[in-house]
C-alpha cells in the first residue's frame, strides 16, 4: 500500500503566440480545481476505462477575477497535494490524466457551473520511494507544470511497496529467513500479512492480503473443514466410512455478499459482484465516493445529498450515464435538418448542409433565387435547395445565357426539314405529312386526318410550331 502524490506548480498560458483568454472575468469570477486519474500499465487504455489505480480531486483554488485588458496570467492554485492512495502493489508503470476544471461563482441557479479547461495525459515509469519527478504538459494554449512521486505507507517498502518491514527485535540480526530491509538496514523484512481473519493454523499466503488453505480446509478464511461424504452428490450426506473427500458447505452457501451483492464461486473461494455504491470482499463497504474516481471521460464528481446519490458525475458534452461511461450518439437524434449530414466531433456536433441550406442545424432554407439573374428574359424558379431558370423561347442553359438551337433534337418527323425561327422552330414537312412536327399523314384521297386546316394554310404548307 502507498500514496501517489501530485503537486501542481502552475497552470497558465503556454509559450508562443495565441495566449488563451482568461477563464474568469469581473462579471464571472471563478476558481480552479484539479482532478487526477491513475491507471496501471503503459497501454493506451480507452478514456472511459476506470481509474483503476485511483483518483483524487483537489480543493478549490482561490477566487480569481480577471483584470480587464490584462493577458491571462498563471492562475491561482489550490493549496496542498493531490493524494491518491493505492491499496495493492505500485505497478511501476502507470498512465495519468490530469484535468483542470473551472468553477464559476456567478449566481447561476439549477446546476453546477463547471467546465473543463484542459486535460493532459501521459504514460510514465516510476519507482515507489524515489524522488519527485517534474513534468510539463501542454493542452492547447495552456501549460501545466507539476511534480509527482509514489511513496509506500509503512510497513511497506520497496519500489513496488510489496515488501514489509518491521523494526528489529534483536540489535544484531533479523529473524530466521528474513533479510534486512535495504535501505533501512535497522529494519527487517516482516512476514507477509495475510487477509484479516485468515486462519493461522489452516491458512497461509504468498501475497499480502490473500488466504490460501492447507489441504482439508476451505472457505475464504480457511476455517471450514472439508467434509467426508458418501460422494453421492457434491453436497451429499456426510459419512465418515467411505473416506471420500468432497467439498464441504459451498463458499456461496448462505450468500456471504452483503447489500444485494451476488455471489459466484471461484476455484479458491468466492467472489461478490457488488451493486453500485458498494464494494469490498463482501460488498460490506458502502458508499463509493468521489475519492474512488467513479466518473469516467472527464466527468466531474461531487458528493450527493442522499443515499441514492452517494456520488454524482456531471458529464462533459457527449457522455452520459451515472458514471459518464456511455458515449452519446448525438447523431442518432437526427439533429441536422433538410438532409444535412451529421458529424459528432466529440466536443461538438457539426452539420454538413446540402446546397441551398445553412445554419448550425441546416435549418435555414436559402433563397435560391436571391442574387441569381436569369438572362434573356428567363424567370428563376426555387426548388430543392437549388435555383433553376425557366428560359424564354430560343434560350437555354443554367442561366438562359446560351442561344438554343431548336433543331438540334431533330424535332420534325417523317423527314421534315427544320428551320430555326426567332420564336422557335418551323418544320417543312415532306410530301404526304402535315402538322407542327410533320407527325400526321395526309390521306391519299386528299382528306386530312386533322380537322380542316385553318384558313390561309393548305395541307403541305410548313407548319409553324408555336
Amino acid at each position: 500500500a502507498g500514496v501517489f502524490e501530485l503537486q501542481i506548480h502552475s497552470f497558465g498560458p503556454g509559450p508562443g503566440p495565441g495566449a488563451p483568454r482568461s477563464p474568469c472575468s469581473a462579471r464571472l469570477p471563478c476558481r480552479l480545481f484539479f482532478r487526477v486519474c491513475l491507471k496501471p500499465g503503459l497501454s493506451e487504455e480507452a478514456a472511459e476505462s476506470p481509474c483503476a489505480l485511483g483518483a483524487a480531486l483537489s480543493a478549490r483554488g482561490p477566487v480569481y477575477t480577471e483584470q480587464p485588458g490584462a493577458p491571462a496570467p498563471d492562475l491561482p492554485l489550490p493549496d496542498g497535494l493531490l493524494q491518491v492512495p493505492f491499496r495493492d502493489a505500485w505497478p511501476g508503470t502507470f498512465s495519468f490524466i490530469i484535468e483542470t476544471w473551472r468553477e464559476e461563482l456567478g449566481d447561476q441557479i439549477g446546476g453546477p457551473a463547471w467546465s473543463l479547461l484542459a486535460r493532459v495525459a501521459g504514460r510514465r515509469r516510476l519507482a515507489a520511494g524515489g524522488p519527485w519527478a517534474r513534468d510539463i504538459q501542454r493542452a492547447g494554449a495552456w501549460e501545466l507544470r507539476f511534480s509527482y512521486r509514489a511513496r509506500c505507507e509503512p510497513p511497506a517498502v520497496g519500489t513496488a511497496c510489496t515488501r514489509l518491514c518491521r523494526p528489529r527485535s534483536a540489535p544484531s540480526r533479523c529473524g530466521p529467513g528474513l533479510r534486512p530491509c535495504a535501505p533501512l538496514e535497522d529494519e527487517c523484512e516482516a512476514p507477509l500479512v495475510c487477509r484479516a481473519g485468515c486462519s493461522p493454523e489452516h491458512g497461509f499466503c504468498e501475497q499480502p492480503g490473500e488466504c490460501r488453505c492447507l489441504e482439508g480446509w476451505t472457505g475464504p478464511l480457511c476455517t471450514v473443514p472439508v467434509s467426508t461424504s458418501s460422494c453421492l452428490s457434491p453436497r451429499g450426506p456426510s459419512s465418515a466410512t467411505t473416506g471420500c473427500l468432497v467439498p464441504g458447505p459451498g463458499p456461496c452457501d448462505g450468500n456471504p455478499c452483503a447489500n444485494g451483492g451476488s455471489c459466484s464461486e471461484t476455484p479458491r473461494s468466492f467472489e461478490c459482484t457488488c451493486p453500485r455504491g458498494f464494494y469490498g470482499l463482501r460488498c460490506e463497504v458502502s458508499g463509493v465516493t468521489c475519492a474512488d474516481g467513479p466518473c469516467f471521460n472527464g466527468g466531474l464528481c461531487v458528493g450527493g445529498a442522499d443515499p441514492d446519490s452517494a456520488y454524482i458525475c456531471h458529464c462533459p458534452p457527449g457522455f452520459q450515464g451515472s458514471n459518464c461511461e456511455k458515449r452519446v450518439d448525438r447523431c442518432s437524434l437526427q439533429p441536422c435538418r433538410n438532409g444535412g449530414l451529421c458529424l459528432d466531433l466529440g466536443h461538438a456536433l457539426r452539420c454538413r448542409c446540402r446546397a441551398g441550406f445553412a445554419g448550425p442545424r441546416c435549418e435555414h432554407d436559402l433563397d435560391d433565387c436571391a442574387g441569381r439573374a436569369c438572362a434573356n428574359g428567363g424567370t428563376c424558379v426555387e426548388g430543392g435547395g437549388a435555383h433553376r431558370c425557366s428560359c424564354a423561347l430560343g434560350f437555354g442553359g443554367r442561366d438562359c445565357r446560351e442561344r438554343a438551337d431548336p433543331c438540334a433534337a431533330r424535332p420534325c418527323a417523317h423527314g421534315g426539314r427544320c428551320y430555326a425561327h426567332f420564336s422557335g422552330l418551323v418544320c417543312a414537312c415532306a410530301p404526304g405529312y402535315m402538322g407542327a412536327r410533320c407527325e400526321f399523314p395526309v390521306h391519299p384521297d386528299g382528306a386530312s386526318a386533322l380537322p380542316a386546316a385553318p384558313p390561309g394554310l393548305r395541307p403541305g404548307d410548313p407548319q409553324r410550331y408555336l
Epitope: G110, G304, A305, P307
Partner: antibody, heavy 117, light 109 residues
Framework: EVQLVETGGGLVQPKGSLKLSCAVS????????MNWVRQAPGKGLEWVAR??????????YYADSVKDRFTISRDDSQSMLYLQMNNLKIEDTAMYYC????????WGQGTLVTVSA | QAVVTQESALTTSPGETVTLTCRSS?????????ANWIQEKPDHLFTGLIG???NRHPGVPARFSGSLIGDKAALTITGAQTEDEAIYFC?????????FGGGTKLTVL
Amino acid sequence: EVQLVETGGGLVQPKGSLKLSCAVSAFTFTTYAMNWVRQAPGKGLEWVARIRNKSNNYATYYADSVKDRFTISRDDSQSMLYLQMNNLKIEDTAMYYCVFYYDYVYWGQGTLVTVSA
Amino acid sequence: QAVVTQESALTTSPGETVTLTCRSSTGAVTTSNYANWIQEKPDHLFTGLIGGTNNRHPGVPARFSGSLIGDKAALTITGAQTEDEAIYFCGLWYSNHLVFGGGTKLTVL
C-alpha cells in the same frame, strides 16, 4: 432550473382523504428518489415519505407517524410524484413540500393541508 | 429513531463568522449521513444551501460552507450579512430515512 410544483392541498375533515401531486421539470425525474416533507404551523420540518427509482424497485419508506395511512407513488412517464393521505388526523395539518435530494436540496413552494372538524 | 440536535438560537453581528452545528444521537455524523442544510425565511420560503455535507448550491453565496467538525456536521457563515437572518435546519440521512434537527434561529444584529 429544477422546478417542483405541489398541488392538491385543501381543507378536509378528520378521517378524510386527500391526494397531493408534485409536477417536476428540468431534470431526469426517472433517475432519482423523491421525498415529501412537511411543516406544521409554528413547528420544524418533518420528513414524511420517500420513494426510490425504478432500478431500486420503487421502494418506499415512511415516517412512523404516517405509516399505514399515507402512500407515496410516482408516475415516471409524466414526471409526477403523489402522496395519497387517508385517515387524516388534526396533527397532519401542515404545509407539504415535494423535495428532491441530489447534489443539493431542491424544494417546491408547498401546498397547505388543513385537517379540521 | 435517531434524534438530531441543533442550537435553538444564535446571535451574531454583520461581518462576523458564525458556526451552526448538527449532532446525531447515534454517534458521530459521517459523510454517510449526507448532511444537508436548509434556510427558512418568512412565508415558508425554503432554500437548499448545502447537500452531501459540503456541496454548496451554485446560487448560494460563497460565505456559506458545510463541513464535519469533530463528531458534528457544521454550517459556517463567514462574514454574516443582515439578510442571513433566518432559521437554519439540518437534515441527516439514516439509510433511507431522513431526520431533521429542530432548527437554529440565527439573528444578525
